[in-house]
Interface confidence: medium
């Protein structure tokens, strides 16, 4: 289980039309459910229940986004429509280039994601928890334009990335 280095970039548009970027670094883990690859895309926050409906067009975005899913306590969803792995697959089917799970409320999901699949996803499936998850969700909950860059080595200077 390698460390995933995640950079989250919040874009603030200025009156002149330029963008100022605010970069937050955090770490997670690549799970065995997916590939240990770099990925980058606009963040789309997804509700775990929103991944249940097979023909739900609300979440059909252009290919290349990074899905962020905060998993709920298992007691709140005793009969989930899909396993955590199934939810990751559903997000990738809908065009996610990577999926990040906040497992803080549901640490059992870590084992589910790391059980190893005969057919792992070809895109990264990362999990975060604790302070890193809080940092991520604080940004995501703003509902403003943000991008995530996932790498399997520590990032260099953030200025090298996100060239507008």
């Amino acid at each position: 289980k390698e460390t995933a280095f995640v950079e989250v970039v919040l874009f603030e548009s200025s009156p002149s039309g330029d963008y100022t970027t605010y970069t937050t670094g955090l770490t997670g883990r690549f799970s065995r459910a997916g590939a240990t690859l770099s990925a980058e895309g606009e963040i789309v926050q997804m509700h775990p229940l929103g991944l249940c409906n097979n023909n739900d067009e609300e979440d059909l975005y252009e290919y290349g986004w990074v899905g962020v899913v905060k998993l709920e306590q298992p007691e709140l969803d005793p009969k989930p429509c899909l396993t955590v792995l199934g939810k990751a697959k559903r997000a990738v089917q809908r065009g996610a280039t990577a999926v990040i799970f906040d497992v803080s409320e549901n640490p059992e999901a870590i084992d589910q994601l790391n059980q190893g699949s005969e057919d792992p996803l070809k895109r990264p499936v990362v999990y975060v928890k604790g302070a890193d998850a809080i940092k991520l969700m604080n940004i995501v909950n703003k509902q403003k334009v943000a991008r995530a860059r996932i790498q399997h080595r520590p990032p260099r200077q953030p200025t090298e990335y996100f060239d507008m």
Epitope: L10, F11, E12, S13, Q45, L49, G50, E58, Q143
Partner: antibody, heavy 121, light 109 residues
Framework: EVQLVESGGGLVKPGGSLRLSCAAS????????IHWVRQAPGKGLEWVGR??????????EYAAPVKGRFTISRDDSKNTLYLQMNSLKTEDTAVYYC????????????WGQGTLVTVSS | DIELTQPPSVSVSPGQTASITCSGD??????VHWYQQKPGQAPVLVIY???QRPSGIPERFSGSNSGNTATLTISGTQAEDDADYYC???????????FGGGTKLTVLG
């Protein structure tokens, strides 16, 4: 069919109270955050407030003009949302809509037909 | 707090392209949603998250958002598009929804 149906509107005197209801059907009501939006006659849309789903904490938030006077609640067992309006003012006269928010995105993909509240002496 | 400004009215001939703007400080940082409302009816979501179209909304509706301006574009405008259009964003400080003042789109003829 996914739908929201408001009821409870009517004529009320300034300073009076009224409770609006919003009955949901065709979807799992408890999973969604629901908002109230109003529209004064001949005017634009104005956000009133919202209540998150229970799993998201059931938190309520309100627009400044109604804070302290209006209360949003929900009864998931009845698939019903409520808006309790107290200390009503003439400027609260409007059609009141309930609207369902797309998960984690405060865009309203399902709206009720609206119910008219008239505050007048 | 962000304030959203829309032109009160826009006119277009059938078959032409209509553009309705929504402006606000640093609007490009926000996700903008667009609603259509016909007289006596509830609003209908036509674009969300700047450019996403809900199922059932015709492909002629599209959206963009950059800098201080978001734009709803209706290409090949039809008579049934004659309506009021509102832009909206969710402002996170404090949490509340903000609507633009609305634009009356008139399809001529």
């Amino acid at each position: 069919e996914v739908q929201l149906v408001e009821s409870g509107g009517g004529l009320v005197k300034p300073g009076g109270s009224l409770r609006l209801s919003c009955a949901a059907s065709g979807f799992t009501f408890s999973d969604y955050g629901i908002h109230w939006v109003r529209q004064a006659p001949g005017k634009g849309l104005e956000w009133v407030g919202r209540i998150k789903s229970k799993t998201d904490g059931g938190i309520t938030e309100y627009a400044a003009p109604v804070k302290g006077r209006f209360t949003i609640s929900r009864d998931d067992s009845k698939n019903t949302l409520y808006l309790q309006m107290n200390s009503l003012k003439t400027e609260d006269t409007a059609v009141y809509y309930c609207a369902r928010a797309i998960y984690y995105l405060e865009a309203f993909d399902v709206w009720g037909q609206g119910t008219l509240v008239t505050v007048s002496s | 707090d962000i304030e959203l400004t829309q032109p009160p009215s826009v006119s277009v001939s059938p078959g032409q392209t209509a553009s309705i703007t929504c402006s606000g400080d640093s609007l490009g940082s926000y996700y903008v949603h667009w609603y259509q409302q016909k007289p006596g009816q509830a609003p209908v979501l036509v674009i969300y998250r700047n450019k996403q179209r809900p199922s059932g909304i015709p492909e002629r509706f599209s959206g963009s958002n950059s800098g201080n301006t978001a734009t709803l574009t209706i290409s090949g405008t039809q008579a049934e598009d004659d309506a009021d259009y509102y832009c909206a964003v969710w402002d996170d400080e404090p949490h509340h929804d903000v609507f633009g003042g609305g634009t009356k789109l008139t399809v001529l003829g």
